[in-house]
Amino acid sequence: KKVVLGKKGDTVELTCTASQKKSIQFHWKNSNQIKILGNQGSFLTKGPSKLNDRADSRRSLWDQGNFPLIIKNLKIEDSDTYICEVEDQKEEVQLLVFGLTANSDTHLLQGQSLTLTLESPPGSSPSVQCRSPRGKNIQGGKTLSVSQLELQDSGTWTCTVLQNQKKVEFKIDIVVLAFQKASSIVYKKEGEQVEFSFPLAFTVEKLTGSGELWWQAERASSSKSWITFDLKNKEVSVKRVTQDPKLQMGKKLPLHLTLPQALPQYAGSGNLTLALEAKTGKLHQEVNLVVMRATQLQKNLTCEVWGPTSPKLMLSLKLENKEAKVSKREKAVWVLNPEAGMWQCLLSDSGQVLLESNIKVLPTWSTPVQP
């Protein structure tokens, strides 16, 4: 007996071939001997089966001795043995219909779990293997679970169902809802305008929810809510904003915040959370602000940074075009009695400059100038 695998919702063609290459009488029946369809001359006739409105054949193939049964919009319960009667012969075809669905929404928050459920006909014993967009393979029986979804899990999951050495492939599009970056760091000189951007790693037609940015300043003992906002159909509206600092927010996506001035008291870490409508849980993005200040007080030239810096970052003071006078893995460096000229304060990581502030030291009889 021939075995054919079908997918729920799909269309399947069950073939039946006669030795004579011409249109002759044929009938398709199910295992209960109920007629599905057949022909009377060149007319298509249908029986009283439950497939009635979903069963069809191709008249143009009859003249070639082919008498297919085409079943549209397959259901799991269409799984059955179908019998084609032609030329006093019976051809049996076993149809097994499978369905694979994500038993939650296919739009999931980063860190959530994905469960895929296989619907299969009674008596079948299929195995399932799924391949994620990043090439990770998972195997299972009736259900497959993936915990802690990551951004790279967004895309088409390809699942292969194996039964009777035959296979059928399902493709399921999964969207992992997350920010493009889990964390970002902004380096600014004191007084500069600060731009924070929170691009999303997904696109959906309508995006509605609400969000908040909590800020933990390095100098503060507790965190504080800097801004709360609403998102309606990708339009951003500010609900509440602190007076200090007075943040500004862009009205369109990607989420965009502007801090008018980088000041040492603002240096620290923030956590932007976004709660999406009809979703449990929230999206998070951490943002860090490092602020640099270079000053000269009497005979002391000082460079300081505030905010979350890694211990491997190097802070240096150097006279332009000369070797560094001082270079330390600390948050403040200074030079006593600096010689006149343009001094550079550099914050660098393995030789790559992250932040630079210049200060002009004038000969001792005049006051310093900051460009």
Epitope: G9, D10, T11, S42, L44, R58, R59
Partner: antibody, heavy 115, light 107 residues
Framework: QVQLQQWGAGLLKPSETLSLTCAVY????????WSWIRQSPGKGLEWIGE???????NYNPSLKSRVTISVDTSKNQFSLKLSSVTAADTAVYYC?????????WGQGTLVTVSS | DIQMTQSPSSVSASVGDRVTITCRAS??????LAWYQQKPGKAPKLLIY???SFQSGVPSRFSGSGSGTDFTLTISSLQTEDFATYYC?????????FGQGTRLEIK
């Protein structure tokens, strides 16, 4: 809802090979036949040929010697190649889904053959 | 090949009119006939299949009848959106063939 999207070169010189591809989005790719039809002012609507998921083909005898229809099931796409084109092959070419009737059509591609 | 002949090749009518288009096959095709509507610059759209069955979404003012060699498409009460070209197609045998079309114009 099934959608058919087609593309390919629109301007050819005589004796060149016409090449068009049609992608099927949504709906079932299996169980159906996938056809190419052309429409020219002189000949009206003319069925070129068809293919199914298994690669089984049927061609219009009037064009059979010049036509090749192929399928790529991994991409839900099928393609038409028509060799040795002449000005008589200038037409709008459509891809379509069929069991007995053409119930879904592509947007059409105007192919002009001119020296 | 089965030849499909439509008549008339064009017809002028007014909104609200009843219009009948006929299609004749050069040999018997049982009920293996479909009707399509085509508007300028667009692909044909299936209206009627198996001679008299409605494709989903097609208004009930369209109806089809016939069997064997003679078939008709009737529009009971013309609407402005019905002014288009109509084609018949046989699915009885390869190669599938179409009628030459009937252009329905506003009077």
């Amino acid at each position: 809802q099934v959608q058919l999207q087609q593309w390919g070169a629109g301007l050819l010189k005589p004796s060149e090979t016409l090449s068009l591809t049609c992608a099927v989005y949504g709906g079932s790719f299996s169980g159906y036949y996938w056809s190419w039809i052309r429409q020219s002012p002189g000949k009206g609507l003319e069925w070129i040929g068809e293919i199914n998921q298994s690669g089984s083909t049927n061609y219009n005898p009037s064009l059979k010697s010049r036509v090749t229809i192929s399928v790529d099931t991994s991409k839900n796409q099928f393609s038409l190649k028509l060799s040795s084109v002449t000005a008589a092959d200038t037409a709008v070419y459509y891809c379509a889904r069929v069991i007995n009737w053409f119930d879904s059509w592509g947007q059409g591609t105007l192919v002009t053959v001119s020296s | 090949d089965i030849q499909m002949t439509q008549s008339p090749s064009s017809v002028s009518a007014s909104v609200g009119d009843r219009v009948t288009i006929t299609c004749r096959a050069s040999q018997g095709i049982s009920s293996w006939l479909a009707w399509y509507q085509q508007k300028p610059g667009k692909a044909p759209k299936l209206l009627i299949y198996a001679a008299s069955s409605f494709q989903s979404g097609v208004p009930s003012r369209f109806s089809g009848s016939g069997s064997g060699t003679d078939f008709t498409l009737t529009i009971s009460s013309l609407q402005t959106e019905d002014f288009a070209t109509y084609y018949c197609q046989q699915a009885n045998s390869f190669p599938y063939t179409f009628g030459q079309g009937t252009r329905l114009e506003i009077k």
